[in-house]
């Protein structure tokens, strides 16, 4: 059964709701470790940008896993990095990301905490349209461990429309996760962090080149969905997870049969959150249109465990907790394609706040 995020508002429900649709049994008050990285003051204004990465690393115990370090010293035993360029980055040293790319210190960064009561219902946000995502086994696709995530490179022909005249083509997809006992999604909802998150990265058809689009409003669009535990195995994800052992080493790349990419996303493409942010890793380019689906994707406990323990990253450390702390909204509004706010009225709120990719 599809599970939605909006069930987290009000009283948490357990098991099946009266509608027969599972709702998330999530405490409204988040635990300390999953608290929003930037608590907004009551007047609705975002605070000055304060990086709470130290607090985040303390609460996650990251000091035991990957010590923050300057990018130029982060290669460990992997050989020399000559030249003065700051090119290495790690999740243990996100405070140093602006040295790698100044855009990482920008005001409109991702990920963010989606606070349901502050979302603006926007009727103009239509269901997404995906075309050509059901790939055949041939040609095969590249699956790689780049030291930061597992990435599936997608072939030409996967088309997506955010709305009329806003067409994109899929470039790649990748995942973010935690450990067996700590969730690792990038976005959070009311401070709640999910076990994992999938990102499908798209390039606007207005640009022929990725680097033309970087930093341009609407140049890139990412579809994001939360992965959540359920009793049943997800057969679509098994087509990826079954190959992780083959790319356990950092830098590994293999070819796997093509698969139905749409099956990796929720079935309900009509209920989602929308905001403008950035890439969540260096170069942290802004102008990225984010679509975060309300419905979660279900994986078995074994599958989530496989995701979190199969890959290795730099310096012979497990590739885990590969998520960036949530970033301040700094005045941005998160729009919802459905009335997600707890006190939402039948009338659309902030209907004029709806933006169009490229505005």
């Amino acid at each position: 059964q599809p599970q939605g995020l909006s069930g987290m508002q009000g009283e948490p429900s357990l098991g099946d709701s009266s509608s027969g649709e599972d709702e998330l049994g999530v405490d409204v008050l988040p635990s300390e470790e999953d608290a929003p990285e930037e608590a907004d003051p009551p007047d609705g204004e975002d605070p000055p940008e304060v990086n709470s990465e130290d607090r985040m690393e303390e609460s996650l115990g990251l000091e035991d896993l990957s010590t923050p370090e300057a990018p130029e010293h982060s290669q460990g035993s992997h050989g020399d990095e000559k030249g003065g360029g700051h090119s290495h980055w790690s999740y243990g040293g996100t405070l140093l990301w602006p040295q790698v790319s100044p855009a990482c210190a920008g005001r409109f960064q991702s990920p963010v905490d989606i606070r349901l009561e502050r979302t603006a219902f926007c009727r103009t946000l239509q269901p997404l349209e995906l075309l050509g995502y059901e790939l055949q086994p041939l040609p095969e696709l590249s699956l790689s461990n780049n030291g930061h995530t597992v990435q599936l490179t997608l072939p030409p022909g996967l088309k997506m429309a955010l709305g009329p005249g806003q067409e994109y083509r899929a470039l790649q997809l990748h995942l973010h996760w935690g450990t067996s006992d700590h969730p690792g999604s990038e976005h959070t909802v009311n401070g709640h962090r999910f076990p994992a998150e999938i990102h499908v990265v798209h390039l606007s058809t207005a640009f022929s080149e990725l680097h033309e689009a970087l930093g341009r409003p609407g140049g890139l669009a990412v579809l994001a969905a939360f992965l959540q535990e359920s009793p049943e195995e997800n057969s679509a994800y098994e087509q990826l997870l079954s190959h992780l052992e083959e790319i356990s080493e950092e830098g590994s790349k293999i070819e796997i049969p093509g698969l139905d990419v749409s099956a990796l996303l929720p079935s309900d493409l009509s209920r989602y959150y929308r905001y403008e942010g950035s890439l969540t890793t260096p170069p942290c380019s802004q102008g990225v249109i984010w679509t975060v689906f309300n419905e979660t994707v279900k994986l078995s406990a074994k599958q989530l465990h496989t995701l979190s323990v199969s890959l290795w990253g730099p310096r012979d450390s497990r590739l885990q907790l590969n998520f960036r702390a949530t970033q301040p909204l700094n005045g941005r509004t998160i729009e919802a394609s459905f009335p997600a706010a707890e006190d939402s009225s039948p009338e659309p709120v902030h209907v004029n706040s709806c933006f169009t990719a490229g505005d």
């Epitope: 992997h78 050989g79 790319s101 030291g147 470039l171 790649q172 990725l210 950092e250 170069p283 990253g313």
Partner: nanobody, 117 residues
Framework: QVQLQESGGGLVQPGGSRRLSCAAS???????????VAWYRQAPGKQRELVAV???????KYSDSVKGRFTISRDSAKNTVLLQMNSLKPEDTAVYYC????????WGQGTQVTVSS
């Protein structure tokens, strides 16, 4: 437009050395700072083969056939990735291609390396 350009190929005797260079041009962002960069090779009548990879963390990986003889490194300041090839063998003869993988794949045109006496 991002362009990758390989250089350094040529004729070399068995047991000799050669250094290949891959330079990126035309991009607003230093692609080698954010991309996993690999060298591939393709011998006549054979499939393209992954030779060496360097990730953005500085991690390196080599195919079994070149381990201990080839070294991949990155010079982000000069926006180049190097492949130092030592103890070359006739079976290393191939066209060598540079590949940068950041959100999308970028390929160079290739440079021919011939190992022959």
């Amino acid at each position: 437009q991002v362009q990758l350009q390989e250089s350094g190929g040529g004729l070399v005797q068995p047991g000799g050395s050669r250094r290949l260079s891959c330079a990126a041009s035309g991009n607003s962002v230093n692609i080698f700072s954010f991309a996993a960069v690999a060298w591939y090779r393709q011998a006549p009548g054979k499939q393209r083969e992954l030779v060496a990879v360097i990730t953005t963390t500085g991690g390196t990986k080599y195919s079994d056939s070149v381990k201990g003889r080839f070294t991949i490194s990155r010079d982000s300041a000069k926006n180049t990735v190097l492949l130092q090839m030592n103890s070359l063998k006739p079976e290393d003869t191939a066209v060598y291609y540079c590949n940068a993988d950041y959100l999308q794949d970028y390929w160079g045109q290739g440079t021919q390396v011939t190992v022959s006496s």
